[in-house]
């Protein structure tokens, strides 16, 4: 029961986390800056992984996508890649974990197969969460670097004078969404890995066969063992003493004087 709960909770937590990673990737508020506040209107600029937007206090918002001619930094491309890899891995992990859920029966799927699928999805969630956390952290580092490098200056360009205003970008809501979502996916993955241990079969009984000796003496064959997976608490090898040429699972209807029961 505890295993099913752990697996189910891990799945739900990961699902929320991956939904958050997708939301963060699509959000425009990765970085924000208040441009100025004049008597006419307050203007805000916020930038995401895919486009930049300007919003006025009147509610008017205009967004423009990034184009290659703007020469996007390699770091931004790296963040995009990390987030997409995180989403893809997370989505595959979710798909695998649905079939791995103990509460869902698909044909005659073995518990060992479910355990393996749970472990696979768990690892995928962990990597997905790490990708998201890494992506958001790289972007945050870009903002911090940009914050300290921003300066106001003036120069003459083509067509007239050009002035740069000292405006600084700060952390947007998407960064916090990304960090939390990445953390949840990571936690969900760990829970799935823990659930995998409990899902693995406790004991697998192998039919051990021992034979009679030619005389009236009892033959002891040390071959009869119960093999354990190592996941369960019972890891002791149990010797089976059997004088007859019978398998361990057979019922002894008429015990002979040579049998040790």
């Amino acid at each position: 029961m505890a295993v099913t709960a752990c697996q189910g909770l891990g799945f739900v937590v990961s699902l929320i986390g991956i939904a958050g990673i997708i939301a963060a990737t699509c959000m425009d508020q990765w970085s924000t800056q208040d441009l100025y506040n004049n008597p006419v209107t307050a203007v805000f600029n916020y930038q995401g992984l895919w486009r930049s937007c300007v919003r006025e206090s009147s509610g008017f918002t205009e967004c423009r996508g990034y184009f290659t001619l703007l020469g996007l930094p390699a770091m931004l491309q790296a963040v995009r890649a990390l987030m997409i890899v995180g989403i893809v891995l997370g989505a595959i992990g979710l798909l695998v974990s649905i079939f791995a859920l103990k509460c869902i029966r698909i044909g005659s799927m073995e518990d060992s197969a479910k355990a393996n699928m749970t472990l696979t999805s768990g690892i995928m969630f962990i990597v997905s969460g790490l990708c998201a956390i890494a992506g958001v952290s790289v972007f945050a580092n870009m903002l911090v670097t940009n914050f300290w490098m921003s300066t106001a200056n003036m120069y003459t360009g083509m067509g007239g004078m050009v002035q740069t205003v000292q405006t600084r970008y700060t952390f947007g809501a998407a960064l916090f969404v990304g960090w939390v979502a990445g953390g949840l996916t990571l936690i969900g993955g760990v829970m799935m890995c823990i659930a995998c241990r409990g899902l693995a079969p406790e004991e697998t009984n192998y039919k051990a066969v021992s034979y009679h000796a030619s005389g009236h003496s009892v033959a002891y064959k040390p071959g009869g063992f119960k093999a354990s997976t190592g996941f369960g608490s019972n890891t002791k090898n149990k010797k089976i003493y059997d004088g007859g040429a019978r398998t361990e699972d057979e019922v002894q209807s008429y015990p002979s004087k040579h049998d040790y029961v």
Epitope: L35, T41, Q47, C53, V54, F60, Y66, L70, L143, Q163
Partner: nanobody, 121 residues
Framework: AVQLVDSGGGLVQAGGSLRLSCAVS????????MGWYRQAPGKQRELVAT???????NYADSVKGRFTIARDNAKNTVYLHMDALKPEDTAVYYC???????????????WGQGTQVTVSA
């Protein structure tokens, strides 16, 4: 590179009208505001009118009711309709645009070369 091309200036009689236009060209992310400033000989450059992309406008007290600023967001162009012109309106009119040039780049103020408006008495 971003370029502002202003045009429409000239010589006009007092009480007459003119229309100035300014187009932004080049690669950039967002235009925040566009507007017009003027500089009369021996004077400081002063605000005439500005507009945001959303249509919020701001006028200098001296031109209120006479000048109208309009924009065409699709063409990234701003217009200044000047009516009831006075001799004191004589100046070089400069187009101005506040632009975010690229990703995580600072707000940049671009200026046009200026167009001369002369109002004769």
């Amino acid at each position: 590179a971003v370029q502002l091309v202003d045009s429409g200036g000239g010589l006009v009689q007092a009480g007459g009208s003119l229309r100035l236009s300014c187009a932004v060209s080049g690669s950039f992310l967002n235009i925040v505001t566009m507007g017009w400033y003027r500089q009369a000989p021996g004077k400081q450059r002063e605000l005439v009118a500005t507009t945001t992309r959303g249509g919020s406008t701001n006028y200098a007290d001296s031109v209120k009711g006479r000048f109208t600023i309009a924009r065409d967001n699709a063409k990234n162009t701003v217009y200044l309709h000047m009516d009831a012109l006075k001799p004191e309106d004589t100046a070089v009119y400069y187009c101005n645009a506040e632009i975010i040039p690229g990703f995580l780049q600072q707000l940049t103020l671009y200026w046009g070369q200026g167009t001369q408006v002369t109002v004769s008495a």
